[in-house]
């Protein structure tokens, strides 16, 4: 199955040799090395780590390893003027202040350059006013507040709990609601698992722990000052007022001890229902403002962070392909962390490091992959996927012509329960076949395959006997490759048994407590889950780079297209009268999906039968497979989101982390009953159906016989 013309290793042993070379002990050692000091984007420490990785990748045997630098907009707290939030009395005196930094974890008390918790890219400001509790600050939470409870957030400071959706969406929603500031906090209901101790005695979030993170709404733009183009030496930069995606109101994150102090005094309306209550001993009143005795007290934010154009460094390693050097399989993950990065990103970076070492070992023995493999250590992911996006912008012409696949490698673990995979449907069969060949690391599944434990613990909601594979959303470095460029992409990690809390992250996410010890003591002492993730990520890269016929199955795309068409049709059919009034039909879309299904089926038959010894035909068939993902790209992009160009998938407009199918139609239909001009709104639905149907049909035709 996997072979290569330019190898001195028996072909059937190539994958085995690669996988056998991966060692848990090495991943452990690399993780330790990468987590001893902070590696914040734009700092000297992270530049030094980039140079260290460059040097080690060269030693491991890659053909070349280069640094690619860009000058991008980053955000930092003011070192002499800390950010905090106060409760002030009627005289303006500060009677309570939130913490200035997290209590340092044991053993790290003397580490310098720990950035205090902040919301990256918050503007400066010192707003004061009454507080309104807005639950998770989701679209539906603001609907509940404004439409049902008639609570006006205009001119108020809102406090929202982290979780469910990307924090940038929360801030955008608060801005649209007229808020003048946002306080984000971690509620124990979302970040404290029952029965587990808080760090340093367990993996739960202590009350002083705080989640950092950017609050941008970039929609795939990359550097806010150079959307669409690389932030290089001769870049033209927008003024800050024209920058993409920056928030307009001050934002600051706090832990649950500080949140308790703010929320315990809340008055006004009671929470609308139990879904608005967290686990703190507070009433979760919505407000606005404080109750009785405290009604004259207000909340004041003090935010002094600054936005600065700063140099960042990607590390790009190349292992040249022996047969198709102009076909690129990319394995990339970020290197920058908020603090120590024990999980995010270094549990991923350590796995990439070991994968590079294994590939390098094979190369030193005389082996080369069929296709070129590019390895990337991205910078400034935490500040908006900046390193990966700038590099892809700089190399977009090469990537759109030569990019076969992108495998993402951020955090290897977010739990230790089972595998989690999000990928293009083209990779479903690759993932299934690979996991059937790998051993499960799970207790109770000794001697069983990874596929078996994964399927048992995370079954597909549609197909019995198969595991769940999710849609790609965003919030990570695959975004530019998949959503903008249309390069087949996938990601894999070990996850928790916490399906209801999918987008809240693990308790210590982006806090100072994400240390090496967190992983080594509580998540993966034997590093067996890390090793399994290395085998999955590395195995996918190996197959994508080495199999004679690309391991893509276009029939799986046909299946999901039908499912997505059914789903969006059923959403639309919640408005049967308007569908009739405005002559809205999905016939064109269903017809296109039917055509795609038939053409994909025929293509798959030809793929079984063609003469694989004919390099021209082989290349032709592989190109049809490679360019299928590209065919779903609309050069005009989605409405108001020009860098989200994939017609089948986009990050949800309400949650960047989540993937939405047929996003153009979905967004056109969203809350359509509230639109002031229904004729125009339904006209946009019809236009989006047209775009989707055309794109599916056009993609189908790329799989037809070429002549």
């Amino acid at each position: 199955k996997s072979s290569n013309e330019a190898t001195n290793i028996t072909p059937k042993h190539n994958m085995k040799a690669f996988l056998d070379e991966l060692k848990a002990e090495n991943i452990k050692k690399f993780l330790y090395n990468f987590t001893q000091i902070p590696h914040l984007a734009g700092t000297e420490q992270n530049f030094q780590l980039a140079k260290q990785i460059q040097s080690q990748w060269k030693e491991f045997g890659l053909d070349s390893v280069e640094l690619a630098h860009y000058d991008v907009l980053l955000s930092y707290p003011n070192k002499t003027h800390p950010n905090y939030i106060s409760i002030i009395n009627e005289d303006g005196n500060e009677i309570f202040n939130t913490s200035l930094f997290e209590p340092p974890p044991p053993g790290y008390e003397n580490v310098s350059d720990i950035v205090p918790p902040f919301s990256a890219f918050s503007p400066q400001g010192m707003p004061e006013g009454d507080l309104v509790y807005v639950n998770y600050a989701r679209t539906e939470d603001f609907f509940k507040l404004e439409r049902d409870m008639k609570i006006n957030c205009s001119g108020k400071i809102v406090i929202a709990r982290y979780g469910k959706v990307f924090r940038g969406n929360k801030v955008k929603n608060a801005q649209l609601a007229g808020a003048k500031g946002v306080i984000l906090y971690s509620d124990p209901a979302d970040y404290f698992a029952p029965g587990v101790k808080s760090y340093p005695d367990g993996w739960n979030l202590p009350g002083g722990g705080v989640q950092r993170g950017n609050i941008l709404n970039l929609n795939g733009a990359g550097d806010p000052l150079t959307p669409g183009y690389p932030a290089n030496e001769y870049a033209y930069r927008r003024g800050i007022a024209e920058a993409v995606g920056l928030p307009s109101i001050p934002v600051h994150p706090i832990g649950y001890y500080d949140a308790q102090k703010l929320l315990e005094k809340m008055g006004g309306s009671a929470p609308p229902d139990s879904s608005w209550r967290g686990s703190l001993k507070v009433p979760y009143n919505v407000g606005p403002g404080f109750t009785g005795n405290f009604s004259t007290q207000k909340v004041k934010m003090h935010i002094h962070s600054t936005n600065e154009v700063t140099r960042i460094y990607n590390v790009i390693g190349t292992l040249r392909g022996a047969v198709e050097p102009d076909r690129y399989v990319i394995l990339g993950g970020h290197r920058d962390s908020w603090v120590f990065g024990g999980i995010d990103p270094q549990s991923g970076a350590a796995v990439v490091h070991e994968i590079v070492r294994s590939f390098g070992t094979l190369k030193k023995e005389g082996w080369r992959p069929r296709r070129t493999i590019l390895f990337a250590s991205w910078d400034a992911e935490e500040f908006g996927l900046l390193g990966s996006t700038e590099w892809a912008e700089e190399n977009s012409r090469l990537l759109q012509e030569r990019g076969v696949a992108y495998i993402n490698a951020d955090s290897s673990i977010e739990g230790n329960y089972t595998l989690r995979v999000d990928c293009t449907p083209l990779m479903y069969s690759l993932v299934h076949n690979l996991t059937k060949e790998l051993k499960s690391p799970d207790e109770g599944f000794e001697g069983k395959s990874l596929y078996e434990s994964w399927t048992k613990k995370s079954p597909s909601p549609e197909f019995s006997g198969m595991p769940r594979i999710s849609k790609l959303g965003s919030g990570n470095d695959f975004e530019v490759f998949f959503q903008r460029l249309g390069i087949a992409s996938g990601r894999a990690r070990y996850t928790k048994n916490w399906e209801t809390n999918k987008f809240s992250g693990y308790p210590l996410y982006h806090s100072v407590y994400e240390t090496y010890e967190l992983v080594e003591k509580f998540y993966d002492p034997m590093f067996k889950y890390h090793l399994t993730v290395a085998q999955v990520r590395g195995g996918m890269v190996f197959e994508l780079a080495n199999s004679i016929v690309l391991p893509f199955d276009c029939r799986d795309y046909a299946v999901v297209l039908r499912k997505y068409a059914d789903k969006i049709y059923s959403i639309s059919m919640k408005h049967p009268q308007e569908m009739k009034t405005y002559s809205v039909s999905f016939d064109s879309l269903f017809s296109a999906v039917k055509n795609f299904t038939e053409i994909a089926s025929k293509f798959s038959e030809r793929l079984q039968d063609f003469d694989k010894s004919n390099p021209i035909v082989l290349r032709m068939m592989n190109d049809q497979l490679m360019f299928l993902e590209r065919a779903f790209i609309d050069p005009l992009g989605l409405p108001d989101r020009p860098f989200y160009r994939h017609v089948i998938y986009a990050p949800s407009s309400h949650n960047k982390y989540a993937g939405e199918s047929f996003p153009g139609i979905y967004d056109a239909l969203f809350d359509i009953e509230s639109k002031v001009d229904p004729s125009k709104a339904w006209g946009e639905v019809k236009r989006q159906i047209y775009v989707a149907a055309f794109t599916v049909q056009a993609a189908a035709e790329t799989l037809s016989e070429v002549a």
């Epitope: 913490s99 930094f101 209590p103 008390e109 001890y257 500080d258 308790q260 102090k261 005795n293």
Partner: antibody, heavy 122, light 108 residues
Framework: QVQLVESGGGEVQPGRSLRLSCAAS????????MHWVRQAPGKGLEWVAV????????FYVDSVRGRFSISRDNSKNTLYLQMNSLRPEDTAVYYC???????????????WGQGTVVTVSS | QSVLTQPPSVSVAPGQTARITCGGN??????VHWYQQKPGQAPVLVVY???DRPSGIPERFSGSNSGNTATLTISRVEAGDEADYYC???????????FGGGTKLTVL
């Protein structure tokens, strides 16, 4: 082992100043709120002041506000109480005590020093 | 601001159960903590958060809190339990620590 040791007490005239120190060892000082509690001769305990682990908050009992100032140096694992304009009623044993919960707001005091005696008399 | 009221003294025979109360406005809605202080020594935390015991404190010491009264219960009292006992709360509305006046436990 976990230990708090107070120093700096002594006899002083009314109106004068004194600075108490509390040296911490055996625990992660920079993660705990720290308190001063006093006990006048033959009387009960009286909470005096607290400083949060990061210095973001300092609270005082009304009778000392404006005269006493609590501070800390996390790099030296030391808590201080600067006492100005001392009065005879400030005469007491002064204890330094640690918050029970790491990184929390004040609640209970789980580790106490042995105390240092402050006598204010003319 | 909270005021905590304790009986000045409680006497109990060895092997019996001693109960020391701590009353106050709203003490039921706040966590109550208890300290033991022997003559010439620093106080020692014996019960925190109404009913939790720090490590090293015998199981004979227990606490409860309901309504406006918290209670420290010492079962199977020993001579070595003779001491002053103080209840304490943190008044978060005024950000002040508040101690009760103390109760002298005498073992007969």
């Amino acid at each position: 082992q976990v230990q708090l040791v107070e120093s700096g007490g002594g006899e002083v005239q009314p109106g004068r100043s004194l600075r108490l120190s509390c040296a911490a060892s055996g625990f992660s000082f920079s993660g705990y709120g720290m308190h001063w509690v006093r006990q006048a001769p033959g009387k009960g305990l009286e909470w005096v002041a607290v400083m949060s682990y990061d210095g973001s908050n300092r609270f005082y009992v009304d009778s000392v506000r404006g005269r006493f100032s609590i501070s800390r140096d996390n790099s030296k694992n030391t808590l201080y109480l600067q006492m100005n304009s001392l009065r005879p009623e400030d005469t007491a044993v002064y204890y330094c005590a640690r918050d029970t919960v790491w990184g929390s707001h004040p609640d209970a005091f789980d580790i106490w020093g042995q105390g240092t005696v402050v006598t204010v008399s003319s | 601001q909270s005021v905590l009221t304790q009986p000045p003294s409680v006497s109990v025979a060895p092997g019996q159960t001693a109960r020391i109360t701590c009353g106050g406005n709203n003490s039921g809605s706040k966590s109550v903590h208890w300290y033991q202080q022997k003559p010439g020594q620093a106080p020692v935390l014996v019960v925190y958060d109404d009913s939790d015991r720090p490590s090293g404190i015998p199981e004979r010491f227990s606490g409860s809190n309901s309504g406006n009264t918290a209670t420290l219960t010492i079962s199977r009292v020993e001579a070595g339990d003779e001491a002053d006992y103080y209840c304490q709360v943190w008044d978060s509305s005024s950000d002040h620590g508040v101690f009760g006046g103390g109760t002298k436990l005498t073992v007969l």
